[in-house]
Amino acid sequence: YNVFPRTLKWSKMNLTYRIVNYTPDMTHSEVEKAFKKAFKVWSDVTPLNFTRLHDGIADIMISFGIKEHGDFYPFDGPSGLLAHAFPPGPNYGGDAHFDDDETWTSSSKGYNLFLVAAHEFGHSLGLDHSKDPGALMFPIYTYTGKSHFMLPDDDVQGIQSLYGPGDEDPNPKHPKTPDKCDPSLSLDAITSLRGETMIFKDRFFWRLHPQQVDAELFLTKSFWPELPNRIDAAYEHPSHDLIFIFRGRKFWALNGYDILEGYPKKISELGLPKEVKKISAAVHFEDTGKTLLFSGNQVWRYDDTNHIMDKDYPRLIEEDFPGIGDKVDAVYEKNGYIYFFNGPIQFEYSIWSNRIVRVMPANSILWC
């Protein structure tokens, strides 16, 4: 997290806000509800209280405007700048302005007013942008899904550094951004994508370029807004420029940023039995056109060319790949080796000699 220079903050805990005008995109009650919920994000974790005024001067004046709207920080038409807010202080201090050239919504369409407002009110209270891609105060808008919003830990630390904790946090679970060099790190899924490696963990993925050591961290939804926050497995089919992503009983085919029509599909359409609830890992072999699908202690082999499951499957993981354990969290193939991830450990397995040749920490893939 980052606070503003000179640690700008309110010197009182009871703050007022006023909605000066409304966007035509939403009903008045939807707008009021979005702002109320956005303030609650911050009051839940601090001693701050927010009261709405219907007229007069409030600490935080909220308005919608377009282009030049009276503060010498003009908006720029659709997309680009969405909103801005001033840090704590008199006059403009704390005020939040929203660009009415955007389409504001209470859903995933356009820009979600609650999410943008919660971010802007962070500025109104003294938080600057965070470098943590998981933080609400990260400067890139990402719709995080329909489920109950949980304020990330980085933002909690930031706001409590200014105002201290509240009496009781009604939602004490604050998602932490994974630390790639945590020795206990386990991974959810790994796939190549157009020459890069995508390493999935919780609602994030690291993107690793072959010539670089520093992996870049992204929210999965910043790349693919329609996908679930977390995924179970992934593999690339390079000759078709597709990647396949699995979550629960569903899977998606993606070309770059775009989901192919007809997806998601059910994993049972691949020929998996109905009792298989999820795929834990998947890896594709371009030379044979086969894909290994792991679930529980079993492995299936799918023929991607003929779109059928191979006979004699499922088989036990321990029988086909002795020594790697009875589950696979994530897997990928490179230069004749399969890399199996099981908890905080990865096994380098030689396809040619059919044996484990190295055991390494899982996060050595991230150069830790």
């Epitope: 659709p78 997309s79 890139i140 808008y141 990402t142 992204f218 910043s222 790349f223 807004p225 420029d241 070309n255 770059g256 940023y257 775009d258 192919l260 029509e261």
Partner: nanobody, 114 residues
């Protein structure tokens, strides 16, 4: 419906630069990914660069660090700035909106001579 028209075709010496543009007509351009593909003679069409609606970029390993993709949603235009061009970059470059099942331009020829 989205119509895409590429411009910026040209011949350039190795090490030179070129900028391709892709003008889109149709109001849904800003809601679609914008990509560049290329096809060299006798080869398959291959991905070059992509930019999401949220302006996150993705490059083929062979062009990363040399090419830059950008978009201007208000103008309905996408760009590909190509620097340090190599003879192997010679191809017909296609603009695409929305991925493989999306919309395609007719292509523009780029020739890089040594």
């Amino acid at each position: 419906e989205v119509q895409l028209v590429e411009s910026g075709r040209g011949s350039v010496q190795a090490g030179g630069s070129l900028r391709l543009s892709c003008a889109a007509s149709g109001s849904t351009f800003s809601r679609r990914s914008m990509n560049w593909y290329r096809q060299a003679p006798g080869k398959q069409r291959e991905f070059v660069a992509g930019i999401s609606t949220g302006r996150i970029t993705n490059y083929a390993v062979s062009v990363k660090g040399r090419f830059t993709i950008s978009r201007d949603n208000a103008e309905g235009t996408g760009y590909l700035q190509m620097n340090s061009l190599k003879p192997e970059d010679t191809a017909v470059y296609y603009c695409n909106a929305g991925g493989l099942q999306g919309y395609w331009g007719l292509g523009t020829q780029v020739t890089v001579s040594s």
